[in-house]
Interface confidence: medium
């Protein structure tokens, strides 16, 4: 039987390196520093030499999305805004609308709103108290419905209390790749005050418990929302059977008219070769077992 | 497999606080998200509000300035607080599990697909 | 709040018709809906999720489609247990609306 794989946060979002230390400017991260961000490569001299000219009128010049290099126009406040979208202006940040029932999508989508971020972080504030106390948990909602705060999250509704992941405990996720023997190891390390080291093995314990994909879906909900940047990419959450097994067929986000491509895999999330599609075609697992 | 069961007063009088507790049993409270949905005799269903294990929630604005959603993981039960009843909140009250399953092209799909039987709360003096 | 709207609001049909029972959004909601089905005395039962996808051991008579606003539950062969009211429930936006419901009848 082939092993299960990782969790997606730790496998599917290692393109997603995280930094240790202040972020910069380069890596589009939050000025207060807390959340993790994405390395992007470095904009040396030629790739800003294939930047075409910024346009003439703008009331603000500012990166290109994700991790391009050459400057747009700035998104102004009350616009739509995506991960997709131009940046919005300094000041501003990108916040889905209060009642999207997802908020990570709606960024994917680009129906954020540029929102003034000092707005943003006081609802930050506000939204993020410390943990409930174990055991017998209870939270005033106070239009705690008002979604992501400043980045994809899943909104604060969906977050965990577990202090471990606390954006409020500014720790810094960085994730290392290594091989032992025949399953893939990730180790992630919590730096902060004190270091703490788990170890995931490509087979958890809870195996018994959920199939490999949907232990991977929650894990991925779980901990995209203390992202501050999603790679330009978007990000990949696997289409699981009830059991909690990968279904056949995988699909990677759509980037506007663009189709995702798609591949196949077995019930625990191998791809099997020859099945792919870059979007020109549909592809079609149905002729395989995955159960 | 899970199964949930709602418990807690048949008869509340006007003005007062209705308290239902749903306990869930053959499965873990944690790593789900828990609801509350209601029923008024004859009449449609009526989404009241969730929460997670952890404990955040989040409520129908329509009754949102009455409702409190609370889980004790240790009993493995969640709560329902509804203050100020009047007739109108006279109803069946379920308690179902509010899960997550992907798909495409969403990344995420959110279903109530295990139900307790439900209760009846009627308000009157 | 995105308003449900479900018609008919009843029908009567015999057993081996097929039903059709349509679903509209206030506003686009993508394929974020789903089927329930209640009996009388009885909690609510998942049929369809995300517009179109069966629920684990539904049968297969019960199909879903749509997107956008408009949607469809349909009943390929009706059989004597599928006489229940049926509701549609969005979860594109908070607050969770359902639809008013379609009650089903066997002639």
């Known amino acids: 039987m082939q092993r299960a794989r990782p969790t997606l946060w730790a496998a599917a979002l290692t393109l997603l390196v995280l930094l240790r230390g202040p972020p910069v400017a380069r890596a589009g991260a939050s000025s207060a520093g807390l959340g993790p961000v994405v390395r992007c490569e470095p904009c040396d001299a030629r790739a800003l030499a294939q930047c075409a000219p910024p346009p003439a009128v703008c009331a603000e010049l500012v990166r290109e999305p994700g991790c391009g290099c050459c400057l747009t126009c700035a998104l102004s406040e009350g616009q739509p805004c995506g991960i997709y979208t131009e940046r919005c202006g300094s000041g501003l940040r990108c916040q889905p609308s209060p009642d999207e029932a997802r908020p990570l999508q709606a960024l994917l989508d680009g129906r954020g709103l540029c929102v003034n971020a000092s707005a943003v972080s006081r609802l930050r504030a506000y939204l993020l108290p410390a943990p409930p106390a174990p055991g017998n948990a209870s939270e005033s909602e106070e239009d705690r419905s008002a979604g992501s705060v400043e980045s994809p999250s899943v909104s604060s509704t969906h977050r965990v209390s577990d202090p471990k992941f606390h954006p409020l405990h500014s720790k810094i996720i960085i994730i290392k790749k290594g091989h032992a023997k025949d399953s893939q190891r990730y180790k992630v390390d919590y730096e902060s005050q004190s270091t703490d080291t788990q170890n995931f093995s490509s087979e958890s314990k809870r195996e018994t418990e959920y199939g490999p994909c949907r232990r991977e879906m929650e894990d991925t909900l779980n901990h995209l929302k203390f992202l501050n940047v999603l790679s330009p990419r978007g990000v990949h959450i696997p289409n699981c059977d009830k059991k909690g097994f990968y279904k056949k067929k995988q699909c990677r986000p759509s980037k506007g008219r663009k189709r995702g491509f798609c591949w196949c895999v077995d019930k625990y999330g191998q791809p099997l070769p020859g099945y792919t599609t870059k979007g020109k075609e549909d592809v079609h697992c149905y002729s395989m077992q995955s159960k | 497999q899970v199964q949930l069961q709602e418990s807690g007063p048949g008869l509340v009088k006007p003005s007062e606080t209705l308290s239902l507790t749903c306990t869930v049993s053959?499965?873990?409270?944690?790593?789900?998200?828990w609801s509350w949905i209601r029923q008024p005799p004859g009449k449609g269903l009526e989404w009241i509000g969730y929460?997670?294990?952890?404990?955040?929630?989040n409520y129908n604005p329509s009754l949102k300035s009455r409702v409190t959603i609370s889980v004790d993981t240790s009993k493995n039960q969640f709560s329902l607080k509804l203050s100020s009843v009047t007739a109108a909140d006279t109803a069946v009250y379920y308690c179902a599990r509010y899960d997550i399953v992907t798909g495409y092209p969403h990344y995420y799909y959110y279903v109530m697909d295990v139900w307790g039987q439900g209760t009846t709360v009627t308000v009157s003096s | 709040a995105i308003q449900m709207t479900q018609s008919p609001s009843s029908l009567s049909a015999s057993v081996g018709d097929r039903v059709t029972i349509t679903c509209r959004a206030s506003?686009?909601?993508?394929?974020?809906l789903g089927w329930y089905q209640q009996k009388p005395g009885t909690a609510p039962k998942l049929l369809i999720y995300a517009a179109s996808s069966l629920q684990s051991g539904v049968p297969s008579r019960f199909s879903g489609s749509g997107s956008g606003t408009d949607f469809t539950l349909t009943i390929s062969s009706l059989q004597p247990e599928d006489s229940a009211t049926y509701y549609c429930?969005?979860?594109?936006?908070?607050?969770?609306?359902f639809g008013g419901g379609t009650k089903v009848e066997i002639k």
């Open positions: 053959g499965g873990s409270i944690s790593t789900y998200y």
């Open positions: 429930l969005q979860d594109y936006n908070y607050p969770l609306t």
């Open positions: 929460i997670y294990y952890s404990g955040s929630t």
């Open positions: 506003r686009g909601i993508r394929n974020a």
